[in-house]
Interface confidence: low
């Protein structure tokens, strides 16, 4: 089948990184600079993505694959394939339309991106607050007051429920 197909369509023999050049009797021509074809048999090469402005090049374009962008330091990617860059804030802040704002009391953000989230409500699990929350860190819940009755052995505080997020930069 492949052989028959290639006899009928000479373009099917053109590998990735080339295009089937109708102007040159359907021979396989290399993709021009700043363009690529990621599959064989293509009649044109696609223009490479340019990482301009706040974007910077994570992976340079080759004849067979598009460039990949990420964001310059101080910004992080949003969207599929890093279609947008959003400004980083400090831990303990969130990005609003007016820029980076501190988390309100009772909320925290342990990353340079994302929104402030409410502190864990320890009492919902029947526990007490062992370590108070801050703008940057969630509260640490400890044993319930009943567990700390006289004679009870001392308890090592549990690790926080979620591991602090690693910032993108």
């Amino acid at each position: 089948f492949e052989r028959t197909r290639s006899l009928q369509d000479p373009c099917s023999n053109c590998p990735a990184g080339t295009f089937c050049d109708n102007n040159r009797n359907q021979i396989c021509s290399p993709c021009p600079p700043n363009s690529f074809s990621s599959a064989g048999g293509q009649r044109t090469c696609d223009i490479c993505r340019q990482c301009k402005g706040v974007f910077r090049t994570r992976k340079e374009c080759s004849s067979t694959s598009n460039a990949e962008c990420d964001c310059t330091p101080g910004f992080h990617c949003l969207g599929a394939g890093c279609s947008m860059c959003e400004q980083d804030c400090k831990q303990g802040q969130e990005l609003t339309k007016k820029g980076c704002k501190d988390c309100c009391f009772g909320t925290f953000n342990d990353q340079k991106r994302g929104i402030c989230r409410p502190w864990t409500n320890c009492s919902l699990d029947g526990k007490s607050v062992l370590v108070n929350g801050t703008k940057e860190r969630d509260v640490v819940c400890g044993p319930s007051p009943a567990d700390l009755s006289p004679g009870a052995s001392s308890v090592t505080p549990p690790a926080p429920a979620r591991e602090p997020g690693h910032s993108p930069q």
Epitope: Q50, C51, K52, G53, V54, R56, T57, R58, E60, D70, T72, P73, G74, D88, H166, P168, Q169
Partner: antibody, heavy 117, light 112 residues
């Protein structure tokens, strides 16, 4: 060929304002960000911040927030560094440089600023 | 901020010698995208800095192959296999992985 040409040396008094220019040629100005670097006499290089030439948005290192302002004249392919309320410690050579793929491939020749009463 | 510490401060050499400059960062320079944005620049007296090495070990166009870069994480080295007169000057390492971007303090390569 690609060039970044900066304005000439400046002699200023404390409290005055200076505006240094960096004119780019030989490439599409808005495709590459422009960064500014300070070098005090006999000292090392210090990154001041950068200008997004596509959006005109600046970003400053903490030590250069307040009295320092980056700006652009895109039609003239020129970036500017303005320093207000000059101090003695602003005496330095200031470089503009182009960022390509995250590294600085072309640099201006530097502008020497002397602040003295 | 990421602190870049270069050693030695001064490196006296004879022409033809091998030279090595070390650069340490206060935190890893591996970016979340997998790249490590560590560069080396050379500044000669009265001149602008010039790019030698980017992304740890990639030589910039026109840079002689006697210059090589290596390292990962927080430790990096620039080596010059045979020092020539035109190599003398101050070498700076630089990180572009974390905001704010930072230079090392510089290493002066000079004749003995």
């Amino acid at each position: 060929q690609i060039q970044l040409v900066q304005s000439g040396p400046e002699l200023k008094k404390p409290g005055e304002t200076v505006k240094i220019s960096c004119k780019a040629s030989g490439y599409s100005f808005t495709d590459y960000s422009i960064h500014w670097v300070k070098q005090a006499p006999g000292k090392g290089l210090k990154w001041m911040g950068w200008m997004n030439t596509e959006t005109g948005e600046p970003a400053y290192a903490d030590d250069f927030k307040g009295r320092f302002a980056f700006s652009l004249e895109t039609a003239a392919s020129t970036a500017y560094l303005q320093i207000n309320h000059l101090r003695d410690e602003d005496t330095a050579t200031y470089f503009c440089t182009r960022s390509s793929y995250g590294y600085f491939d072309y640099w201006g020749q530097g502008t020497t600023l002397t602040v003295s009463s | 901020d990421v602190v870049m510490t270069q050693t030695p401060l001064s490196l006296p050499v004879s022409l033809g010698d091998q030279a090595a400059i070390s650069c340490r960062s206060s935190q890893t320079l591996e970016h979340i995208n997998g790249n490590t944005y560590l560069e080396w620049y050379l500044q000669k007296p009265g001149q602008s800095p010039k790019l030698l090495i980017y992304k740890v070990s990639d030589r910039f166009s026109g840079v002689p192959d006697r210059f090589s870069g290596s390292g990962s994480g927080t430790g990096f080295t620039l080596k010059i296999s045979r020092v020539e007169a035109e190599d003398l000057g101050v070498y700076y390492c630089f990180q572009g992985s974390h905001f704010p971007l930072t230079f090392g303090g510089g290493t002066k390569l000079e004749l003995k």
